[in-house]
Interface confidence: medium
C-alpha cells in the first residue's frame, strides 16, 4: 500500500498504474471506522497483487481530497487509466472486496 | 441473524411476465450487492446479475440481458427479479443470494417460476 | 466471459474413499470458489478463496489450485458428502461449473 503525500504523487501514481485497477482510500486518523478497515484494506493488498492500492490522509493531503471530492471518511475510489470507476463510503470490507472483483 | 426471504412459486403464461422479490433482514441491502441466480430443473446454477442498492447500478450475464430486470427498494429491503417475455426456457428455480467474500454467503429459499398454457 | 469446465459430470465412491474433482477454467483466476447442492434446498458455501473452508464444512474437506486449474478433494468419502459440487469464480462477470454430482457407492 502506497502512502501518498501530494497532489503530484497521486497524479503519478495513478499515471503509473497503466491498466491495472488503482484502489484508493481516503482516511484520517482520527476516524474510528478508517483505523478498523485499514489492516483488512492491507491483506486486499497482498490478495490482490495486480491491483495498485493507495491511501490518502485526508488532513496531510487536503487538496487531493478536495480534488477527489471526498466529503465523508472512509472513502474508497476506484480508477483506471486515470479515470474514476467506483466510489463509496464506509467501512463495508464485504462491499471493498465485491468492488475490486467487479472492476479487478 | 441474516435471512433473505423469496416470494412464492409462480404459474406464468408464455409471454407473460414475472416479479420475484427477495426480502432481507438482519442487513441493510445497501451494504452490499444483491445477485439473483438461475437454475433450470436437473440443471446447473447460472448467474443472472446483481445490483447495488445504494445506487442502483445493474450488472447482467449478457445472456440475460433483456430478458432480465434487476431492482430494489432500499425502503423495504428488498431486492427484486423481473423476467419478461416468459417462455419455457424460463421454467426454473430462481435464487436471490448475498454472495460474499470474507464473510458468510447467504442464499434465498428460492422462487420456482413455471412457464406453461 | 470465463468458462468454467467441471470433471467428472459424475462420479461415485465408496465410504472411506479418497474423492478429487476439478474445475478448469478458459481463463486465469485468482481465486475459486465451490458450493455444495443437495436436491430440493440452495447451494452452500463450502470452500472459498481457493483453499478455505466455509463455517462448518468437515476438515476432511480441502481446495487447491491457482491459475485455471482448480480441485476439491475429500479425504475419506462419507454418506453426507453425496451432493452436487459447483465451482465458481468471481470477476467482473460470475459465472459457475456445471457441476460434478458426487454419488455414494
Known amino acids: 500500500v502506497k502512502q501518498i503525500e501530494s497532489k503530484t504523487a497521486f497524479q503519478e501514481a495513478l499515471d503509473a498504474a497503466g491498466d491495472k485497477l488503482v484502489v484508493v482510500d481516503f482516511s484520517a486518523t482520527w476516524c474510528g471506522p478508517c483505523k478498523m478497515i485499514k489492516p483488512f484494506f492491507h491483506s486486499l493488498s497482498e490478495k490482490y497483487s495486480n491491483v495498485i492500492f493507495l491511501e490518502v490522509d485526508v488532513d496531510d493531503c487536503q487538496d487531493v481530497a478536495s480534488e477527489c471530492e471526498v466529503k465523508c471518511m472512509p472513502t474508497f475510489q476506484f480508477y483506471k487509466k486515470r479515470e474514476k470507476v467506483g466510489e463509496f463510503s464506509g467501512a463495508n470490507k464485504e462491499k471493498l472486496e465485491a468492488t475490486i472483483n467487479e472492476l479487478v | 441473524e441474516v435471512q433473505l426471504q423469496q416470494s412464492g412459486a409462480e404459474l406464468v403464461k408464455p409471454g407473460a411476465s414475472v416479479k420475484l422479490s427477495c426480502t432481507a433482514s438482519g442487513f441493510n441491502i445497501k451494504d452490499t450487492f444483491m445477485h439473483w441466480v438461475k437454475q433450470r430443473p436437473e440443471q446447473g446454477l447460472e448467474w443472472i446479475g446483481r445490483?447495488?442498492?445504494?445506487?442502483?447500478?445493474?450488472k447482467y450475464d449478457p445472456k440475460f440481458q433483456g430478458k432480465a430486470t434487476i431492482t430494489a427498494d432500499t425502503s423495504s429491503n428488498t431486492a427484486y427479479l423481473q423476467l419478461s417475455s416468459l417462455t419455457s426456457e424460463d421454467t426454473a428455480v430462481y435464487y436471490c443470494a448475498l454472495l460474499q467474500y470474507s464473510a458468510m454467503d447467504y442464499w434465498g429459499q428460492g422462487t420456482s417460476v413455471t412457464v406453461s398454457s | 466471459q470465463i468458462v468454467l469446465t467441471q470433471s467428472p459430470a459424475i462420479m461415485s465412491a465408496s465410504p472411506g474413499e479418497k474423492v478429487t474433482m476439478t474445475c478448469s477454467a478458459s481463463?486465469?483466476?485468482?481465486?475459486m470458489y465451490w458450493y455444495q447442492q443437495k436436491p430440493g434446498t440452495s447451494p452452500k458455501r463450502w470452500i472459498y478463496?481457493?483453499?478455505k473452508l466455509a463455517s462448518g464444512v468437515p476438515a476432511r474437506f480441502s481446495g487447491s489450485g491457482s491459475g485455471t486449474s482448480y480441485s476439491l478433494t475429500i479425504s475419506t468419502m462419507e454418506a453426507e458428502d453425496a451432493a452436487t459440487y459447483y465451482c465458481h469464480q468471481r470477476s467482473s462477470y460470475p459465472t459457475f461449473g456445471a457441476g460434478t454430482k458426487l454419488e455414494l457407492k
Open positions: 445490483i447495488d442498492p445504494a445506487n442502483g447500478n445493474t
Open positions: 478463496d481457493t483453499s
Open positions: 481463463s486465469r483466476i485468482s481465486y
